[in-house]
Interface confidence: medium
């Protein structure tokens, strides 16, 4: 049997259908059905229209385009290539839009792209080359200077055993082509750990938003590289306690803020360092709202006003809270 | 050369089990979803099941739901589809297909194998 | 669950006429979603027309496909005897997700 033709005047990693563009160009004010337009915002929203793939008459001016609230399943290759490209879309928001499955290449073709939002999709197949679009060893930078993956977990039935923090992080490491990432969020997505490997290969991050995951230690975490970090939010996580590595790393980093709380903090001889730590430094501006949750006669005690008498580890901890 | 080569067919009694195998050669397998699709000796196609390139994403006809696992190697570079709770009305020849993947025109099959027989049959 | 039904079930056509088989599914879709394919006797079906009118690799020109919405047809502009075979349209919708095929217009030659 014989494969489909594949014409095409990009150079790409993947083949470019020219009939997958609209067969003309749009004309400069056109509008797609079921989209709203303004030339002089250089906006586009086709918002809540159960859209099931991406308008191929998108306006050459676009620079914001709104896609949410759609069901587009898949994200194929090229599926915002177009003849003449979108030179101008500089923000993309396709968050709340069923999107299951992103493959390699989905953004190719958008030499602008500076802000994607894929949050609240269900990703159970994000491609290690969704945003580098080539599997080379070091591919050329991508645009994208702001990354908003907030909820793409998807549901706990549809994860077919695989690593999900594995999954995301290979995306965001292929061929380092996010290395001119200032802005990463990933709250919301049921993290259990942080891979070794995630924070290296993202050395321009100055915001990194992990709240609202289920974190419960920072141990194989490196933030040595990331030297311009200026935010990052582990709220709202299962963090015990923080290591002498950890707080050192923070300490060497000169303009970071750690926001740490609501998180099950152990108040016990491990503690000791991170309470000392907490007393001095000017780098977790909540620190006054961090409070024990255990052992139970701890429990409601702000970190700061422990001494290391009060830190022992004669205290048996829940059964759940032994196992990291 | 892009081949699929189907095995593991055979006959099975009604309530059995069998397992079906798709070896492709040719192609980066990982870069490809992949389906299962059947052709009914009254000679219908019909879809049964598809698997996204990483394998994370998968989908089922609702009559094989909870009866059929589709899955993947991607490092054997070959598709499995495991039956059980087979019925007589799942006799038909079963292929796999490859979907392409670099256009937007989705779930378009451009490469299929030659099929292998399955008889559900007391 | 959308519905593909075929016309004709079965049709013979002499060498040089145009023959039309249409599609028509059971509520609106996109037309990239809506494919065909060829099968002959004996043989694994070809992939044949993508997205409602782009021919696949080596399909002769005297193909075409068109339509949009609930209505779709291929067209042969002048039969040939190699022509001959069951053509099957196929369709995808996201939600829920479920891929569906016509039930076949085979196509003879007279």
């Known amino acids: 049997s014989s494969p489909t033709s594949s014409a095409s005047s990009f150079s790409s990693s993947a083949p470019f259908l020219a009939s997958a563009v609209s067969a003309q160009p749009p004309l400069p004010d056109q509008c797609p059905a079921l989209c709203e337009c303004s030339e002089a915002a250089r906006t586009v929203k086709c918002v809540n229209r159960n859209l099931t793939e991406v308008p191929t008459d998108l306006p050459a001016y676009v620079r914001n385009l709104f896609l949410t609230g759609n069901q587009l399943a898949v994200l194929p290759a090229g599926a915002f290539a177009r003849r003449p490209p979108l030179a101008e879309l500089a923000a993309l928001n396709l968050s709340g839009s069923r999107l299951d499955e992103v493959r390699a290449g989905a953004f190719e073709h958008l030499p602008s792209l500076r802000q994607l939002d894929l949050s609240h999709n269900p990703l159970a197949d994000l491609s290690p080359f969704a945003f580098s679009g080539s599997n080379a060893s070091v591919s050329a930078p991508s645009p994208l200077v702001e990354l908003i993956l907030n909820h793409i977990v998807p549901p706990e039935d549809e994860r077919q055993n695989r690593s999900f923090e594995g999954m995301v992080v290979a995306a965001l490491r292929s061929g380092l082509a996010l290395r001119g990432l200032t802005r990463l969020e990933l709250a919301s997505n049921h993290f259990l750990f942080l891979p070794r490997d995630l924070l290296a290969q993202l050395p321009s991050l100055r915001y990194l938003d992990l709240r609202n995951n289920s974190l419960v230690s920072l141990t194989y975490a490196s933030f040595r590289n990331l030297t311009h970090l200026e935010s990052l939010h582990l709220e709202d996580n299962a963090l015990k306690v923080l290591h002498n590595s950890t707080l050192a790393e923070w300490h060497g980093l000169a303009h970071v803020k750690v926001f740490l709380d609501n998180n099950p903090w152990v108040c016990d001889c491990y503690m000791a360092d991170m309470v000392a730590w907490l007393k001095e430094t000017e780098v977790v501006p909540d620190k006054a709202r961090l409070t024990c949750a255990f052992p139970e006669k701890m429990r409601n005690r702000g970190l700061l006003d422990l001494n290391s008498s009060d830190l022992d580890c004669d205290a048996v901890l829940p059964q759940s809270l032994q196992t990291s | 050369e892009v081949m699929l080569v189907e095995s593991g067919g055979g006959l099975v009694k009604p309530g059995g089990s069998l397992k079906l195998s798709c070896a492709a050669s040719?192609?980066?397998?990982?870069?490809?979803?992949m389906s299962w699709v059947r052709q009914t000796p009254e000679k219908r196609l019909e879809w049964v099941a598809y698997?996204?390139?990483?394998?994370?994403?998968?989908y089922y006809l609702d009559s094989v739901k909870g009866r059929f696992t589709i899955s993947r190697d991607n490092a054997k570079n070959t598709l499995y589809l495991q039956m059980s709770s087979l019925r007589s009305e799942d006799t038909a020849l079963f292929y796999c297909?490859?979907?392409?993947?670099?256009?937007?025109?989705?779930?378009?099959?451009?490469?299929w194998g030659q099929g292998t027989t399955l008889t559900v049959s007391s | 669950e959308i519905v593909l039904t075929q016309s004709p079930a079965l049709m013979a056509a002499s060498p040089g006429e145009k023959v039309t088989i249409t599609c028509s599914v059971s509520s609106s879709i996109s037309s990239s979603s809506l494919h065909w394919y060829q099968q002959k006797s004996g043989a694994s079906p070809k992939p044949w027309i993508y997205g409602t009118s782009n021919l696949a690799s080596g399909v002769p020109v005297r193909f075409s496909g068109s339509g949009s919405g609930t209505s779709f047809s291929l067209t042969i502009s002048s039969m040939e005897a190699e022509d001959a075979a069951t053509y099957y349209c196929?369709?995808?919708?996201?939600?829920?997700?479920?891929?569906?095929f016509g039930a076949g217009t085979k196509l003879e030659l007279k």
């Open positions: 297909a490859r979907e392409e993947s670099y256009n937007y025109y989705r779930h378009f099959f451009d490469y």
């Open positions: 196929q369709q995808w919708s996201s939600y829920p997700p479920i891929l569906t």
């Open positions: 698997i996204s390139s990483g394998g994370g994403n998968t």
């Open positions: 040719g192609f980066t397998f990982s870069d490809y979803a």
